[in-house]
Interface confidence: low
């Protein structure tokens, strides 16, 4: 008789999750010489230890501390790119502009990107059927707590000018409930961070509006200013051209506004 299993509202653990985490770790440490010392087996053991045998609605940041310790990584604090609801373009940008980093360019972000995972209380099994949904079930689930933890640490590490890419096609260009709005904004350190510069990415071909005047951007400016951090904002009217000009800055067409 199959044992009764809690049914959650969200999708289950990503297929081949352990192998995927291990493969990503091996690949990352091969390609990033500064992380070659990392023992991927230990990383997986620490990752597993954060959620296996624990109730998937009762995960804490403390559960992830062993993993955080193993994944400690120094990225240039003045080269950090945050993003909200525009992950693909942010990643494409840092793949071209190799000296800038999103969270997913770090080992821990890379390991978990696009994956889902959870366990079950009192069993060593991974739940491949369903995992808690942040809204419908609980916020203290393994995935949400992981991203809250790594996002907080990433923001805390930032210094000088911090950039954030925002999606100008969304109704809320800045969303207080996003990871950026609820975690990263509040963990930038005013004694280290001088300016937050927002890049608002336009979606429409002929969209020439100044989205830096959007009410939600003004709200972001207000939050940042109250934290004694300067704020600046730029419209990226042509994201395709923007990327092209990052690749080939000497191109004559790149002197005009993008």
């Amino acid at each position: 008789v199959p044992r009764w299993r809690q049914q959650w509202s969200g999708p289950g653990t990503t297929k081949r999750f352990p192998e995927t985490v291990l493969a990503r770790c091996v690949k990352y440490t091969e390609i990033h010489p500064e992380m070659r010392h990392v023992d991927c087996q230990s990383v997986w053991d620490a990752f597993k230890g954060a959620f296996i045998s624990k109730h998937p609605c009762n995960i804490t940041e403390e559960d992830y501390q062993p993993l955080m310790k193993l994944g400690t990584q120094t990225v240039p604090c003045n080269k950090i790119l945050l993003w909200s609801r525009i992950k693909d373009l942010a990643h494409q940008f840092t793949q071209v502009q190799r000296d800038m980093f999103t969270l997913e360019d770090t080992l821990l972000g890379y390991l978990a990107d696009d994956l889902t995972w959870c366990g079950e209380f009192n069993t060593s099994k991974i739940n491949y059927q369903s995992c808690p949904d942040w809204r419908k079930d609980c916020s203290n689930n393994p995935v949400s707590v992981f991203w809250k933890t790594v996002s907080r640490r990433f923001a805390e590490a930032a210094c000088d000018v911090v950039h954030v890419m925002l999606n100008g096609s969304r109704s809320k260009i800045f969303d207080k409930n996003s990871t950026f709005g609820s975690v990263e904004v509040h963990n930038l350190q005013p004694e280290k961070v001088q300016t937050l510069e927002a890049w608002v990415i336009h979606g429409g071909r002929e969209d020439s509006r100044d989205l830096c005047q959007d009410p939600t951007i003004k709200e972001l400016e207000s939050i940042i200013s109250k934290r004694n951090i300067q704020f600046s904002c730029k419209n990226i009217y042509r994201p395709d051209k923007f990327l092209q000009c990052v690749k080939n800055p000497e191109d004559s067409s790149c002197t005009s506004e993008i």
Epitope: T20, A23, R24, K27, I31, D88, H91, Q92, T94, Q95, V96, R98, T102, E104, D105, Y110, D113, D114, K247
Partner: nanobody, 121 residues
Framework: QVQLQESGGGLVQAGGSLRLSCAAS????????MGWFRQAPGKEREFVAT????????TYADSVKGRFTISRDSAKNTVYLQMNSLKPEDTAVYYC??????????????WGQGTQVTVSS
């Protein structure tokens, strides 16, 4: 879809050299990294070398450092692996692999069929 075609494998004596080529084709080709992996009989596939497509940054496995050189010809969409001072333990099937533009690949997205390298003592 991206296709990768390796060539240049063969039988060589210990101490000898071989040059492997990997030609990438397919209209979606825009790889961040291309690399070489190898798999010896009864062993797991292991990393050999990788090269960043735009910047040309290279990374090598400790076992081949100083003996193997990875390079690329962007115009030909081709990556090369120059293998010098070959040892019997370098005997394996050598696979070329390419990584997609996004940073979120689990492993390399595209793989060639492999080319056999045999080093006799």
């Amino acid at each position: 879809q991206v296709q990768l075609q390796e060539s240049g494998g063969g039988l060589v004596q210990a101490g000898g050299s071989l040059r492997l080529s990997c030609a990438a084709s397919g209209r979606t080709f825009s790889s961040v990294a291309m690399g070489w992996f190898r798999q010896a009989p009864g062993k797991e596939r292991e990393f050999v070398a990788t090269i960043n497509w735009s910047g040309g940054r290279t990374t090598y496995a400790d076992s081949v450092k100083g003996r193997f050189t990875i390079s690329r010809d962007s115009a030909k969409n081709t990556v090369y692996l120059q293998m010098n001072s070959l040892k019997p333990e370098d005997t394996a099937v050598y696979y070329c692999a390419a990584d997609r533009f996004s940073v979120v690949a689990v492993e390399y997205d595209y793989w060639g069929q492999g080319t056999q390298v045999t080093v006799s003592s």
